[in-house]
Amino acid sequence: IWELKKDVYVVELDWYPDAPGEMVVLTCDTPEEDGITWTLDQSSEVLGSGKTLTIQVKEFGDAGQYTCHKGGEVLSHSLLLLHKKEDGIWSTDILKDQKEPKNKTFLRCEAKNYSGRFTCWWLTTISTDLTFSVKSSRGSSDPQGVTCGAATLSAERVRGDNKEYEYSVECQEDSACPAAEESLPIEVMVDAVHKLKYENYTSSFFIRDIIKPDPPKNLQLKPLKNSRQVEVSWEYPDTWSTPHSYFSLTFCVQVQGKSKREKKDRVFTDKTSATVICRKNASISVRAQDRYYSSSWSEWASVPCS
Amino acid sequence: RNLPVATPDPGMFPCLHHSQNLLRAVSNMLQKARQTLEFYPCTSEEIDHEDITKDKTSTVEACLPLELTKNESCLNSRETSFITNGSCLASRKTSFMMALCLSSIYEDLKMYQVEFKTMNAKLLMDPKRQIFLDQNMLAVIDELMQALNFNSETVPQKSSLEEPDFYKTKIKLCILLHAFRIRAVTIDRVMSYLNAS
C-alpha cells in the first residue's frame, strides 16, 4: 500500500480468482483513543471499533472511503483504491491501446518544434468518475524539470456502438535548448483513476522522435504563361523552430485528382516552391518534414487547381 | 561561442555536400545494423545514449546559431580552443568562432573515425562475420575531414590484446551509430546554416 495523495491510498493486488488479497491497517487521524467506529462509503454498518482497523482487501467491494467517527462526528477519511497486477503485468483497463506506432501504445505525444513543448493524448471509452494526473521529467535517475498542465477532454467521437473520449495535456521542458542533442529521454507518467480503480501509464521518448511540423502556410499557385504548369509556393509554418537555415524542412508536393484512384504525382524538394502540372479538378498538397531527422510528416496543406 | 551571420561568397561552402553524404551514410549504416542485429538491443529505446565526444569537444555550443545565443538554456560554460585553419573557411573574413565550430566538428569526426576503425578490426575477427562497418561511411567521414582540412595530431588506432567480446562489440556499435547519427544531424544543420549565412 502507498499514498497517492493526502488520505488516498493505493493497494496493489495480485489479481486472480480466490487470491488472498492484502491485509491493510488503517489508522484514524485523531488524538482520540476511545469510542472510535469505522464505516465504509455511505453505509452505516460498523466495520470495527478502535483507533485502527485491520481489513483484508481482495476485491473492489473492499475498496472505497473508510471513515472513522466518534459520537456521530467524522474524525478522518482514508480512500482505498485498487491497482490490479494480472500475471505480473499491471492492468490497463482504463485507457485504450492506440496500437500506433506499436501495440501497447496508450499515450501518444507530438511536438511541433524543438522548443521543449509537447502535447500528449490518450483515449478511453469511460465517460464518468474519471480523473487524470500527469507528471513529466527529463530522465528518471536525476530528473530535470518538465511542467505539465491539467489533462482536459479534447475530443469526443463515436466508434461503432461506443463513444470514445480523447484527453490531452500540454507539457513544457523547463530549460530547453532547441539545438541540444538529447541523451536522456523525456518521461511522461499519467495516473488514471476510474471509480476505485487506479492505473498508471508511462511513455518515454526524445523530442526529436515525436516531431511533427505544422503544415506549410500560405500555399499559393501562380500559373506559368502559355503552359499547363503552375508554380506552387509556400512558407515554413509559424510554429517551426528558427532559424530556418539551421532547422531546415524538406517538402513533399502532391498533385491529386478528384478520384482517389487517380495516379498521384509527387515531387520532393528542400525549396519553398516547385513547378508542377495542374490537372483539371485536381488539388495540390504540400507537407513538411525535418530535413535531417526523419520523424513524422506534417498534415497536408491543400489548394484546388482551378 | 556562436556563429555570426556573415555573408560569404556564393558557393563557398564545399562542406555542405559532404555533410549531407555523411548523414545519408550513417543513417544507412544504422538501419543495416538494426536489421542485422535484430536479436541485440539496438533500437533507440533499448540502448544507452552515450556521447564519446562529451567533455572533449563542444560542437553544439561552438556551432550555436546567433539567434539561439539569447536562449540561456543553450549557453553552456564549456569552452574548448581549437586550431583554426580549415579550408571550408574560404573567406579571410570568417570569424574565429566559426573556425572554432568547424574545428570542433573535425575533432568529432576524428574521434568517431578512430572508434569505428578499432571496432571494425574487432568485427572482422568475429567467426559469425555478422556485420562490418560500411566502407562508404568511413570514406565519407574521411572526405569531410579532408574538406575541413584542419591540422591535427593523428590519434593512434586503439589496439586491444584481449580476446574481443563480440556481443559487447556489437552493442557498442549500435550505441556509437546512434550517437554519430545525432551528431551528423547537428553537423548537417550547422553546414546548412553556414551555407545560408
Epitope: 495480485d14 489479481w15 486472480y16 480468482p17 480466490d18 487470491a19 476485491e59 473492489f60 497486477k85 494480472e86 500475471d87 505480473g88 503485468i89 483497463d93 506499436k102 501495440n103 501497447k104 471509452t125 | 536479436f39 538491443p41 533499448e46
Partner: antibody, heavy 115, light 112 residues
Framework: QVQLVQSGGGVVQPGRSLRLSCAAS????????MHWVRQAPGKGLEWVAF????????YYADSVKGRFTISRDNSKNTLYLQMKSLRAEDTAVYYC????????WGQGTMVTVSS | SYVLTQPPSVSGTPGQRVTISCSGG????????VKWYQQLPGTAPKLLIY???QRPSGVPDRFSGSKSGTSASLAITGVQAEDEADYYC????????????FGTGTKVTVLG
C-alpha cells in the same frame, strides 16, 4: 472453491459450427479475464483467444481469427467460444482458463472435425 | 508458431536432478515473467511455477524455477516416478500480450 465446467464439444463436419461453454463458479466471474487454450492430439498447448473481464476487448490467435468468437455473459457466469468454418486442424481438446498469476483450468472438452 | 523452445525430452533416474530449459527472446521472456505447467496424460495442465521462481501452495519444493535474460529453466531435484509428465513453459510477448505464449513442451521420463 473455483470451478470451471466445460460443455459443448463433439464431432462436427468441416465447414460447420460449434459453440463451447465454460460455466464458472466459486469466484466473481465478472472481475477476471478468461482464455481459451487448445491441444491437438499428441501436440503441445496453443492459445486460442482472450476476453477482458467486461467483454470490452477480445484477442485471437491468427489461426482462428475471423472464424472463432469469444464472448461472455457475466450475468450467467459463463464464457463461450463460437467456432465457425471448422477445419480438420481445429481438432483438439479445448480448455477454458482464468487469467492471472495463479490460474484455474476447465476439465477440457474434445472437438473433432471430421467428414 | 512456437517462439519458446524446449528440449523435446529429458530423462533421469529417481532421485536425480532434472532440468528443462525454455529459450525465448527479448520481447517475451526478456520482458515478461515465466510460468511452468505440468500435464499428466488425459488431464488439464497444472501450475507448478509462476513469476519465474514462485511456487503455488501445494507444489512440492523439489520443483524450482529460474530466469536469466531471455531463457528460463525448471529444475526437479530428486525426480520421482510421479513426475513423469509433459512440462510447458509459458510467457507473453510485448507485441501480442495478453496472448499466451507456450513452449514446445518437454516429455520427462523417469527411468528404472
Amino acid at each position: 472453491q473455483v470451478q470451471l465446467v466445460q460443455s459443448g464439444g463433439g464431432v462436427v463436419q468441416p465447414g460447420r459450427s460449434l459453440r463451447l461453454s465454460c460455466a464458472a463458479s466459486g469466484f466473481t466471474f465478472s472481475s477476471y479475464g478468461m482464455h481459451w487454450v487448445r491441444q491437438a492430439p499428441g501436440k503441445g498447448l496453443e492459445w486460442v483467444a482472450f476476453i477482458r473481464y467486461d467483454g470490452s476487448n477480445k484477442y485471437y490467435a491468427d489461426s482462428v481469427k475471423g472464424r472463432f468468437t469469444i464472448s461472455r455473459d457475466n450475468s450467467k457466469n459463463t464464457l463461450y467460444l463460437q467456432m465457425k468454418s471448422l477445419r480438420a486442424e481445429d481438432t483438439a481438446v479445448y480448455y477454458c482458463k482464468t487469467h492471472g498469476s495463479h490460474d484455474n483450468w476447465g476439465q477440457g472438452t474434445m472437438v473433432t472435425v471430421s467428414s | 508458431s512456437y517462439v519458446l523452445t524446449q528440449p523435446p525430452s529429458v530423462s533421469g533416474t529417481p532421485g536425480q536432478r532434472v532440468t528443462i530449459s525454455c529459450s525465448g527472446g527479448r520481447s517475451n521472456i526478456g520482458s515478461h515473467t515465466v510460468k511452468w505447467y505440468q500435464q499428466l496424460p488425459g488431464t488439464a495442465p497444472k501450475l507448478l511455477i509462476y513469476g519465474n521462481d514462485q511456487r503455488p501452495s501445494g507444489v512440492p519444493d523439489r520443483f524450482s524455477g529460474s530466469k536469466s535474460g531471455t531463457s528460463a529453466s525448471l529444475a526437479i531435484t530428486g525426480v520421482q516416478a510421479e513426475d513423469e509428465a509433459d512440462y510447458y513453459c509459458q510467457s507473453y510477448d510485448r507485441g501480442t500480450h495478453p496472448a499466451l505464449l507456450f513452449g514446445t513442451g518437454t516429455k520427462v521420463t523417469v527411468l528404472g
